[in-house]
């Protein structure tokens, strides 16, 4: 009778074990072990027992002890079970950003590991078990489907293997994959709203606003605003699930023409874009040209209005004949024309919009001086000791200086309240002087003496 000890062994891969082969007869003809494993016999006294060290056990094995006794030959097997944790526990790669509402398939692959009967694969979200299955196949593969929700944002998914050797008196061996952090997002199907001027004048600034509602997580949204090749630098304001990006856009003569304004919102691995065309135009104010801005009375004056070649002008409300970018009028300057405004209005059509520009010039007409009976009466008769205000108004441009002198020495206080005395009586020479010349007019003051009874 041949026996073996131990009859069952569980050992780590590459480990060693001592196996004792015994026989019941005292003088066996043969006593040995049959195994492909490297073996080393340990010397013991006696003939009916042998101890072997089996090493580098890589896989399950069944070494067999045998003995040949007078009563016959017999064998006994020992069962060596090798255990090892998986060499690879991996979640199949996935894009980190996943849209809310999508079915996400998590796939865990496990390579190696034994004994398989004791090996379980667990899929987790955080610490919560999603699926538990025995490891089957090589590699073993376990899958589960998750419906992506908003509250999954930032959650860690992982795969764990459990090699449970506790029934064999050993422990529970766990291996965990690298976590996959899920980033969930909502990007609505509606494109962003883009508000901007349809036309923009060269050397001016416009404001562009791009906004979108219903985003999650809004802080992760990237906004790209551009006009043609010019990248804009917006100021972004965030709401709970919305943003508004505001940017100033400056355009120069080089940008003239039709430009494409784009607003792109990128969230996760998706994007939404809105395009709009902006027409950049150059339209200087019309030019009002006076032959001379300051002329003397009676001078012929030409007023010209010149504008952008495609503009249509009106000069003082009168359209150019024929309708176009130039208009002019001729006039003979009169005092009434002093301070007269000549206004040129130009209209240009840009991308279906009418743009208006105005320019005004004022004409100064130099005239005078003038002194006439209506504004400077030639005769005053006032009672002695009464309060009177001598009035004499000179007209002209520039406004003349007026002095009324009696005998070249006594001034008459024009516009002042005076007490009438005998000294005031007499003939005054009123002189109105300006750069345009001088006019004189005689004014007589008569003083009535009070009658005494």
């Amino acid at each position: 009778q041949t026996s073996v000890s131990p009859s069952k062994v569980i050992l780590p891969r590459g480990g060693s074990v001592l196996v004792t082969c015994s026989t019941s007869c005292d003088q066996p003809k043969l006593l040995g072990i049959e195994t492909p494993l490297p073996k080393k016999e340990l010397l013991l006294p006696g003939n009916n027992r042998k101890v072997y060290e089996l090493s580098n056990v890589q896989e399950d094995s069944q070494p067999m002890c045998y003995s040949n006794c007078p009563d016959g030959q017999s064998t006994a097997k020992t069962f060596l079970t090798v255990y090892w944790t998986p060499e690879r526990v991996e979640l199949a790669p996935l894009p980190s950003w996943q849209p809310v509402g999508k079915n996400l398939t998590l796939r865990c692959q496990v390579e190696g590991g034994a004994p398989r009967a004791n090996l379980t694969v667990v899929l987790l979200r955080g610490e919560k078990e999603l699926k538990r299955e025995p490891a089957v196949g090589e590699p073993a593969e376990v899958t589960t489907t998750v419906l992506v929700r908003r509250d999954h944002h930032g959650a860690n998914f992982s795969c764990r293997t459990e090699l449970d050797l506790r029934p064999q008196g050993l422990e529970l061996f766990e291996n965990t994959s690298a976590p996959y952090q899920l980033q969930t997002f909502v990007l609505p199907a509606t494109p962003p709203q883009l508000v901007s001027p349809r036309v923009l004048e060269v050397d001016t600034q416009g404001t562009v606003v791009c906004s979108l509602d219903g985003l999650f997580p809004v802080s992760e949204a990237q906004v790209h605003l551009a006009l043609g090749d010019q990248r804009l630098n917006p100021t972004v304001t965030y709401g709970n699930d919305s943003f508004s990006a505001k940017a100033s856009v400056s355009v120069t003569a080089e940008d003239e023409g039709t430009q494409r304004l784009t607003c792109a919102v990128i969230l996760g691995n998706q994007s939404q874009e809105t395009l709009q065309t902006v027409t950049i135009y150059s339209f200087p104010a019309p030019n009002v040209i006076l032959t001379k801005p300051e002329v003397s009375e009676g001078t012929e004056v030409t007023v010209k209005c010149e504008a952008h070649p495609r503009a249509k002008v009106t000069l003082n409300g009168v359209p150019a004949q024929p309708l176009g970018p130039r208009a002019q009028l001729l006039l003979k300057a009169t005092p009434e024309d002093n301070g007269r405004s000549f206004s040129c209005s130009a209209t240009l059509e840009v991308a279906g919009q009418l743009i208006h520009k105005n320019q005004t010039r004022e004409l100064r007409v130099l005239y005078g001086p003038r002194l006439d009976e209506r504004d400077c009466p030639g005769n005053w008769t006032w009672p002695e000791n009464s309060q009177q205000t001598p009035m004499c108004q000179a007209w002209g441009n520039p406004l003349p200086e007026l002095k009324c002198l009696k005998d070249g020495t006594f001034p008459l206080p024009i516009g002042e309240s005076v007490t009438v005395t005998r000294d005031l009586e007499g003939t005054y020479l009123c002189r109105a002087r300006s750069t345009q010349g001088e006019v004189t007019r005689k004014v007589t003051v008569n003083v009535l003496s009070p009658r005494y009874e």
Epitope: E401, K403, L405, D407, G408, T409, F410, P411, P413
Partner: antibody, heavy 116, light 110 residues
Framework: SVEESGGGLVKPGGTLTLTCTVS????????MGWVRQAPGKGLEYIGI?????RTYYASWAKGRFTISKTSTTVDLKITSPTTEDTATYFC??????????????WGPGTLVTVSS | AYDMTQTPASVEVAVGGTVTIKCQAS??????LSWYQKKPGQRPKFLIY???KLASGVPSRFEGSGSGTEFTLTISGAQSDDAATYYC????????????FGGGTEVVVK
């Protein structure tokens, strides 16, 4: 322009006539005045002859000074001068016509010294 | 009588400083007042007429104001060249007067 002449040394009690010669304007349309400044003293108004030939004097000057004119000259006659009359005498156009050009037309002045 | 009283008789001012000279008429002369600058050995220079109007060529640092009986000449940002005696003169009445001129104000610029 206006220019005074006739100044110099005169004895107290004598008679002295200063002449103001004008050019570039007509005396028939301008008043002419006389002003003096004694050494270390202020400007002192003497009198004026109007465009109508009428004369006006400072109260202290009446009887001691006489102003008269021809077509191109204005005279100031000093009767019985005293040492108090030692001064520079200026001839002035339009002293009361205070336009921008008024009172700018002053002669350079002529010095009268009254001394025995 | 239209007598003119000028104050002060003398005033000292630093370069860049401001001088104010007052002139008072014994009765209203409306705005018929002129100001002159007089330097020794030179004819008087016409500065201001009609109380506040600047004669041509006169720097804007000279300013006249007032009407009726009270008048003022102000020199702002005085220059060394402004050292002189300044006179006011009424240009309203040429008869029955003692003197058409004020007594003068000597301005010394330090």
């Amino acid at each position: 322009s206006v220019e005074e002449s006739g100044g110099g040394l005169v004895k107290p009690g004598g008679t002295l006539t200063l002449t103001c010669t004008v050019s570039g304007f007509s005396l028939s349309s301008h008043a002419m005045g006389w002003v003096r400044q004694a050494p270390g003293k202020g400007l002192e108004y003497i009198g004026i002859i109007g465009s109508s030939d009428r004369t006006y004097y400072a109260s202290w000057a009446k009887g001691r000074f006489t102003i008269s004119k021809t077509s191109t000259t204005v005279d100031l006659k000093i009767t019985s001068p005293t040492t108090e009359d030692t001064a520079t005498y200026f001839c002035v156009r339009d002293p009361y016509d205070s336009y921008d050009d008024g009172y700018r037309l002053w002669g350079p002045g002529t010095l009268v010294t009254v001394s025995s | 009588a239209y007598d003119m009283t000028q104050t002060p008789a003398s005033v000292e001012v630093a370069v860049g400083g401001t001088v104010t000279i007052k002139c008072q008429a014994s009765q209203s002369i409306y705005r018929y007042l002129s100001w002159y600058q007089k330097k020794p050995g030179q004819r008087p220079k016409f500065l201001i007429y009609d109380a506040s109007k600047l004669a041509s060529g006169v720097p804007s640092r000279f300013e006249g104001s007032g009407s009726g009986t009270e008048f003022t000449l102000t020199i702002s940002g005085a220059q060394s060249d402004d050292a002189a005696t300044y006179y006011c003169q009424q240009a309203y009445s040429s008869g029955s007067i003692d003197n058409a001129f004020g007594g003068g104000t000597e301005v010394v610029v330090k």
